[in-house]
C-alpha cells in the first residue's frame, strides 16, 4: 500500500507525480525534481521535498537554552543533491562551484569552500529542539495535557514514535519540543526525527505537505493552539565546524 | 514469557468506586503503551483508556467523563484503573492490553480480565 | 471521531468453507486496522495488524486486506475452531474517540 490505489494519489506527499504504472497496476508515485519513487504510506525525506519545492513553478527557566553548537537553518531554500535512498549527500553546491557540508536535516554545519572541500561522512542530527510560541489565551494550557497532545500529534499524525519526543516543555507562551533519536536507536521503518520535524514546521506555516487531510488543527482539552512563530535548532552528534570569524 | 494479569475486580454497590490493577511481566513497561478495555456480559469490546507509562500521558474516551482514572507505577510493572460513580451499566469484565510497541495502537497482548458487578 | 461498524453481526459457515467479514470507518484511516478473535470466557486474540499483516503464530488461513475505509477479514477452510466473534479496531488515532472497536461478527460454524 504505497498510495491510495483507488484515485492514486500520495496521502502523505502532494508533491508527488503518480500513475498506476507500478508491478500490477499498482499506484505509483514520483516525487516532483528527482523523480525517486517515494513510500507514501510514510513521510517523504526533508531532501526529496526541498527537491521537489525548488522544482516546483515560482509563483525562561524551565525551557532548554540550546548549546553552542546548536544550528539554524539561516541559509534558506536550495537545490539539494540526494543519495538514492533521499537522504542529503554530505556534501552540497551551487551552481556557481561554492560548497558545504551539511547534517542529516541538510543544515549547513561548515564555512562555504570551493569545489576542493572535502565532507566526510553524513553526520546525524540526533537532537532536534522546536521552539514555540503560541497566541495568547484566556489561561495557560495545563502543562500534562499540552505533552500529550504534542505526542500524539507526533505519534498519529507524523508517525514519530512517543520514545523520539524526549520532551516537551511549557512557559506560557512559548513551548518547545525535544526530539532526540540516535543512529543506534532508529530501527528500519521509523521516521526520521529530521522528517518530522519539517513536516511539523510546514503544518505550523500552513503550508501541510499531506494530500487530501486537513491543515493541522491542535487542540487542548478542546482550546485551539495556534502557534505564531517557530525556530529550530539542530544538534549533531558530531559538533559542526565553523571558522572563528563566523563567530564574531 | 510476556504476560499481563489483572486483579482487583469484585462486586460494588452503585455509586461506589474500585482500584483495578494490571501486573505486567517479561518486558518492560515503558516500551508499550497499554490499555484498558471492558465487555458488558454478551457484549462487544469497549476501549477505556490508554497511557504511554514511559511519560505517564493518558488519553481517554470521550464517554469516561472524568469517571475513571488510569495510570501506572512504572517501577512496579503496573497498570491501574480506578472507577468511580459506578452504575450496573458498567458491569463488565475489565481487559488491559498492551501494544505492540510500534507507532499504531494494535493490542497484541491482553490480560485474562477481571470481573466487576456493580449491584445492591 | 472515527466510528467502526462491522457486518455482518452473525454469519453461519460450513466446516471447510470461506468466510469474509467486512469492517467499514467512518474516516480514512489507511491501513491503521487490525482483527482480532474472541472465543468465550477468554480474552481477544490479535490475528491481524496493519490491515493485511498475520500477527504471530496465526494460520495463514485468515487474511486481511483494505485500505482507507473499507476492510475484510477472510477465512478460509474454516474449521470448528474457528468459532468465534471477531472484531475489527482502528488503530489510527485514540484522539477524540468514543470506541475504535466494531461491534464484532459472530462466526458458527456447521
Known amino acids: 500500500h504505497t498510495a491510495a490505489q483507488d484515485n492514486c494519489t500520495c496521502p502523505t506527499n502532494k508533491m508527488t507525480v503518480c500513475s498506476p504504472d507500478g508491478p500490477g497496476g499498482r499506484c505509483q508515485c514520483r516525487a516532483l525534481g528527482s523523480g525517486v519513487a517515494v513510500d507514501c504510506s510514510t513521510l517523504t525525506s526533508k531532501c526529496l521535498l526541498l527537491k521537489a519545492r525548488m522544482s516546483a513553478p515560482k509563483n525562561a527557566r524551565t525551557l532548554v537554552r540550546p548549546n553552542e553548537h546548536a544550528l539554524v537553518d539561516n541559509d534558506g531554500l536550495y537545490d539539494p543533491d540526494c543519495d538514492p535512498e533521499g537522504r542529503f549527500k554530505a556534501r552540497q553546491c551551487n551552481q556557481t562551484s561554492v560548497c558545504w557540508c551539511v547534517n542529516s536535516v541538510g543544515v549547513r554545519r561548515t564555512d562555504k569552500g570551493d569545489l576542493s572541500l572535502r565532507c566526510d561522512e553524513l553526520v546525524r542530527t540526533h537532537h532536534i529542539l522546536i521552539d514555540l510560541r503560541h497566541r495568547p489565551t484566556a489561561s495557560a494550557f495545563n502543562h500534562s495535557d499540552l505533552d500529550a497532545e504534542l505526542r500524539r500529534l507526533f505519534r498519529e499524525r507524523y508517525r514519530l514514535h512517543p520514545k523520539f519526543v524526549a520532551a516537551v516543555h511549557y512557559e506560557q507562551p512559548t513551548i518547545q519540543i525535544e526530539l532526540r533519536q540516535n543512529t543506534s536507536q532508529k530501527a528500519a521503518g521509523d521516521v526520521d526525527i529530521g522528517d518530522a520535524a519539517y513536516y511539523f514546521e510546514r503544518d505550523v506555516k500552513g503550508e501541510s505537505l499531506f494530500q487530501g487531510r486537513g491543515g493541522l488543527d491542535l487542540r487542548v482539552r478542546g482550546e485551539p493552539l495556534q502557534v505564531e512563530r517557530t525556530l529550530i535548532y539542530y544538534l549533531d552528534e558530531i559538533p559542526p565546524k565553523f571558522s572563528m570569524k563566523r563567530l564574531t | 514469557q510476556e504476560q499481563l494479569k489483572e486483579s482487583g475486580g469484585g462486586l460494588v454497590q452503585p455509586g461506589g468506586s474500585l482500584k483495578l490493577s494490571c501486573k505486567a511481566s517479561?518486558?518492560?513497561?515503558?516500551?508499550?503503551?497499554v490499555s484498558w478495555v471492558r465487555q458488558a456480559p454478551g457484549k462487544g469490546l469497549e476501549w477505556i483508556a490508554y497511557?504511554?507509562?514511559?511519560?505517564?500521558?493518558?488519553y481517554y474516551a470521550t464517554w469516561v467523563n472524568g469517571r475513571f482514572t488510569i495510570s501506572s507505577h512504572n517501577a512496579q510493572n503496573t497498570l491501574y484503573l480506578q472507577l468511580n460513580s459506578l452504575t450496573a451499566a458498567d458491569t463488565a469484565t475489565y481487559f488491559c492490553?498492551?501494544?505492540?510497541?510500534?507507532?499504531?495502537?494494535?493490542?497484541?497482548?491482553w490480560g485474562p480480565g477481571t470481573l466487576v458487578t456493580v449491584s445492591s | 471521531d472515527v466510528v467502526m461498524t462491522q457486518t455482518p453481526a452473525s454469519v453461519e459457515v460450513a466446516v471447510g468453507g470461506t468466510v469474509t467479514i467486512k469492517c467499514q470507518a467512518s474516516?480514512?484511516?489507511?491501513?491503521?486496522l487490525a482483527w482480532y478473535q474472541q472465543k468465550p470466557g477468554q480474552p481477544p486474540k490479535q490475528l491481524i495488524y496493519?490491515?493485511?499483516t498475520l500477527a504471530s503464530g496465526v494460520s495463514s488461513r485468515f487474511s486481511g486486506s483494505g485500505y482507507g475505509a473499507e476492510f475484510t477479514l477472510t477465512i478460509s477452510g474454516v474449521e470448528c475452531a474457528d468459532a468465534a466473534t471477531y472484531y475489527c479496531?482502528?488503530?489510527?488515532?485514540?484522539?477524540?474517540?468514543?470506541?475504535?472497536f466494531g461491534g464484532g461478527s459472530e462466526v458458527v460454524v456447521k
Open positions: 479496531q482502528q488503530a489510527l488515532t485514540i484522539g477524540n474517540v468514543d470506541n475504535p
Open positions: 492490553a498492551r501494544d505492540a510497541g510500534s507507532v499504531d495502537y494494535n493490542f497484541n497482548l
Open positions: 517479561g518486558f518492560d513497561f515503558n516500551n508499550y503503551g
Open positions: 497511557i504511554y507509562p514511559a511519560f505517564h500521558n493518558t
Open positions: 474516516k480514512n484511516i489507511d491501513s491503521n
Open positions: 496493519a490491515a493485511s
